[in-house]
């Protein structure tokens, strides 16, 4: 039962990078706003987004509490100026969003490769520790910290000349490598979880070349 | 239940050309990559190559690198490996086989492998 | 590329046998090492990962292990349905190289 010339919210989809966290749905509201709700299986009810005409609701704040429980979501639909209005049982119409676990599902995003070093004939190359929105003693935690070693790392990386691609990969945000001596290389990297089922892999990060500013050459 | 189904094997005359198909089914291909094995009759183990299906990075052994290309369509979940310029010493059972990706990731599940012959 | 030397190319053991397989990489290759079984007209099936650790399924007759550069492939007790062929491989870099093979034969 539902309030009426309101709509039920629908296709409520999670939307998440490295943890911040957005709930999506539709339609577009005509004479009606939203109101969100989150909650953990075990937990209470808590009200976010109030009374907006919006068709998302950054929930970012909540699951970072906790990104290893799963979260269920719900939309709830008012008639626009009338939020007090209910059904004739007593309550607004609203939906449930699909539950959702941040750890295992959280999109990995586009890592950087922060530096490459040469010396002579091995590359240290460094992939940036991203920063996340998950909190602890009042401290941003970096992706490393809060997957551990659940994140890996692939590098792939080929001569300049060269359209194979190698790879290596690291439980760390380091890699050192073999390459030879008086060739240029190029990288790329990849974030993966490999314990995971879905959402394992990140996007490429953008690809880097020696004798581009990042790097460093040291003949030894 | 994880399956990796190779086809597209046979009897093929030196100079010739095949494509063999790997059809992925119970995992999304481009959340891993895919390698290509092949044996010889009798004889052991050889990696021919693997491509990352998410980005489209391959690399290929020296012994088919310019005869060999590994592709794949994540639409059909499925990798493939195209063969040209076949040599007798080609001859053998091709496996495709999924990498998980981890640190230590070896491959974890191999498909029954398909059989081909180069002859005259 | 990294050459893996597995040695002896072949055995013969009887049921209840310990049964050791090594392999010799030829620079260092970590952990990055697995052990594969394959039996006639069948596909490889992996046994052990990252030198050591078990693969799940795989009976606890089998144990992996490390040493430098040197990883071996121990089977307790050999079973009627160890008889097989058995190959190391490093996935350390590319290209992944593996081992010649080890062929465990009935005595």
């Known amino acids: 039962s539902g309030t009426t010339n309101t709509v039920a919210a629908y296709n409520l989809t999670w939307k998440s990078t490295n943890f911040k966290t957005i709930l999506e749905w539709e339609p577009k509201p005509v004479n009606q706003v939203y109101t969100v709700q989150i909650s953990t299986k075990s937990g209470d009810w808590k009200s976010k987004c109030f009374y907006t005409t919006d068709t998302e609701c950054d929930l970012t704040d909540e699951i970072v509490k906790d990104v290893k429980q799963t979260y269920l979501a719900r939309v709830f639909s008012y008639p626009a100026g009338n939020v007090e209005s209910t059904g004739s049982a007593g309550e607004p119409l609203y939906e449930n969003s699909p539950e959702f676990t941040p750890y295992l599902e959280t999109n990995l995003g586009q890592p950087t490769i922060q530096s490459f070093e040469q010396v002579g004939t091995k590359v240290n190359v460094t992939v940036e520790d991203e920063r996340t929105l998950v909190r602890r003693n009042n401290t941003f935690l970096s992706l490393r910290d809060v997957f551990g070693k659940d994140l890996i790392y692939t590098l792939y990386y080929w001569k300049s000349s060269s359209s194979g691609k190698k790879t290596a990969k690291t439980n760390t945000n380091e890699f050192l490598i073999d390459v030879d001596k008086g060739e240029n290389y190029c990288f790329s990297v990849q974030a993966v979880i490999p314990s995971r089922t879905v959402n394992r892999k990140s996007t490429d990060s953008p690809v880097e070349c020696m004798g581009q500013e990042k790097g460093e050459f040291r003949e030894i | 239940e994880v399956q990796l189904v190779e086809s597209g094997g046979g009897l093929v005359q030196p100079g010739g050309s095949l494509r063999l198909s790997c059809a992925a089914s119970?995992?999304?291909?481009?959340?891993?990559?895919i390698h290509w094995v092949r044996q010889a009759p009798g004889k052991g183990l050889e990696w021919v190559g693997y491509i990352d299906p998410s980005n489209g990075y391959t690399y290929h052994a020296d012994s088919v690198k310019g005869r060999f290309t590994i592709s794949a369509d994540t639409s059909k979940n499925t990798a493939y490996l195209q063969m040209n310029s076949l040599r007798a010493e080609d001859t053998a059972v091709y496996y495709c086989a999924r990498d998980p990706q981890s640190v230590s990731s070896p491959f974890d599940y191999w498909g029954q492998g398909t059989l081909v012959t180069v002859s005259s | 590329d990294i050459q893996m030397t597995q040695s002896p190319s072949s055995l013969s053991a009887s049921v209840g046998d310990r049964v050791t397989i090594t392999c010799r990489a030829s620079q260092d290759v970590n952990t990055a090492v697995a052990w594969y079984q394959q039996k006639p007209g069948k596909a490889p099936k992996l046994l052990i990962y990252s030198a050591s650790f078990l693969y799940s399924g795989v009976p606890s007759r089998f144990s992996g292990s490390r040493s430098g550069t040197d990883f071996t492939l121990t089977i307790s007790s050999l079973q009627p349905e160890d008889f097989a062929t058995y190959y190391c491989?490093?996935?350390?870099?590319?290209?992944?190289?593996f081992g010649q093979g080890t062929k465990v034969e009935i005595k």
């Open positions: 119970g995992f999304t291909i481009s959340d891993y990559t």
């Open positions: 491989q490093q996935h350390y870099t590319t290209p992944p190289t």
